[in-house]
Amino acid sequence: LPRWRQQWSGSGTTSRFPETVLARCVKYTEVHPEMRHVDCQSVWDAFKGAFISKYPCNITEEDYQPLVKLGTQTVPCNKTLLWSRIKDLAHQFTQVQRDMFTLEDMLLGYLADDLTWCGEFNTFEINYQSCPDWRKDCSNNPVSVFWKTVSRRFAETACGVVHVMLNGSRSKIFDKNSTFGSVEVHNLQPEKVQALEAWVIHGGREDSRDLCQDPTIKELESIISKRNIRFFCKNIYRPDKFLQCVKNPEDSSCLSGI
């Protein structure tokens, strides 16, 4: 008889999850010489150990500490790019501007990007049928706790001028409930971070409003101020031109505003 399995509201673990994580790890360590020392089998074991056999609504940041330790990586000062609700453009940017890094350009973020996973209490099985949904089931699920843990660490280790890309098309350009708004912004360390510079990405071609005056940006400025960190904001009116100018800064059209 098949065992009874908890039904969650979210989609199940991504198919071939162990193989995907291992393959991504191998690929990453081959491409990044500074991470060649990393043993990918140990990384997978630590990843697995964080959620296998554990009730998937009772995962803690502590569960991920062995993995975090193995994936320790530093970003040079002034080279951290955070993002909120605009992942694709942030990643397109760091693919061109190779000396800047999002969390997903780091080993742990790269391993887990776009994947879902969970286990079951007291069994060594991975649940491919369903996993807890953050809203409908619980917030302390394997995926959410993972991103909270690595996002906190990514923000804590940032230094110099930190940049964040925000989606100007959303009703809340800065959302206190996003990972950036609830975790990263509160873990920037004033001893190391001189300033946060927000890039507000405009959606419409004819949108000439100054979105840096948006009330939610004032909320972000307030939080950053309370942390004794300077705040700057820039409108990126033409994201397509912005990327083009990152690729070809000498282009004559890039000397005017973006």
Partner: antibody
Framework: QIQLVQSGPELKKPGETVKISCKAS????????MNWVKQAPGEDLKWMGW????????TYAEEFKGRFAFSLETSASTAYLQINNLRNEDTATYFC????????????????WGQGTSVTVSS | ETIVTQFPASLSMAIGEKVTIRCITS??????MNWYQQRPGEPPKLLIS???TLRPGVPSRFSSSGYGTDFVFTFENMLSEDVADYYC?????????VGGGTRLEIK
Amino acid sequence: QIQLVQSGPELKKPGETVKISCKASGYTFTNYGMNWVKQAPGEDLKWMGWLNTNTGEPTYAEEFKGRFAFSLETSASTAYLQINNLRNEDTATYFCARWYYGSSDNSYAMDYWGQGTSVTVSS
Amino acid sequence: ETIVTQFPASLSMAIGEKVTIRCITSTDIDDDMNWYQQRPGEPPKLLISEGNTLRPGVPSRFSSSGYGTDFVFTFENMLSEDVADYYCLQSDSLPYTVGGGTRLEIK
């Protein structure tokens, strides 16, 4: 223990300049921003702005742009408020207050305040 | 900027009574409201900070509630030492703004 100690009362004539000090002790001065708050006689509190104690960068509320200047002496863990070209309406008590943030949670608070410096402007 | 309206402006209460002060904000400030007590000749003292958090050392008879635009500060069992001015301060967005204050006296 944490303390913010401000300089003593000032009696000035219109057009003169005053500089108020706020000396911090009991914590790492450069870790926390410093606010300045005005309280005119019989009136409520008005937030004037804040000073980044790492960089010395001031941020002023609209009403306090121009004649008001925040500055810093990091080695002495001291913040300053200077008011130029004093007017009668500058007569008030001025408070410094630090912005605290919790390291283990997202808690923020203007928690410790100086005792206040009374500035009287009268011809 | 966010306008903070505080009422009542003054309050006369008997010892032992329950005190209630209210602040309304012109914009949604989540729960970023702070409550201060200011006794004559003293600086403001923080009683409750963002998230309706009672500060260490502040008696548990003080409490606050509210989210968005409507906030209430209460304390049970008024004592003579509670005679003071009370202010609410929103710290959601710059510039930070303060309510007009409530003067509390003994009846």
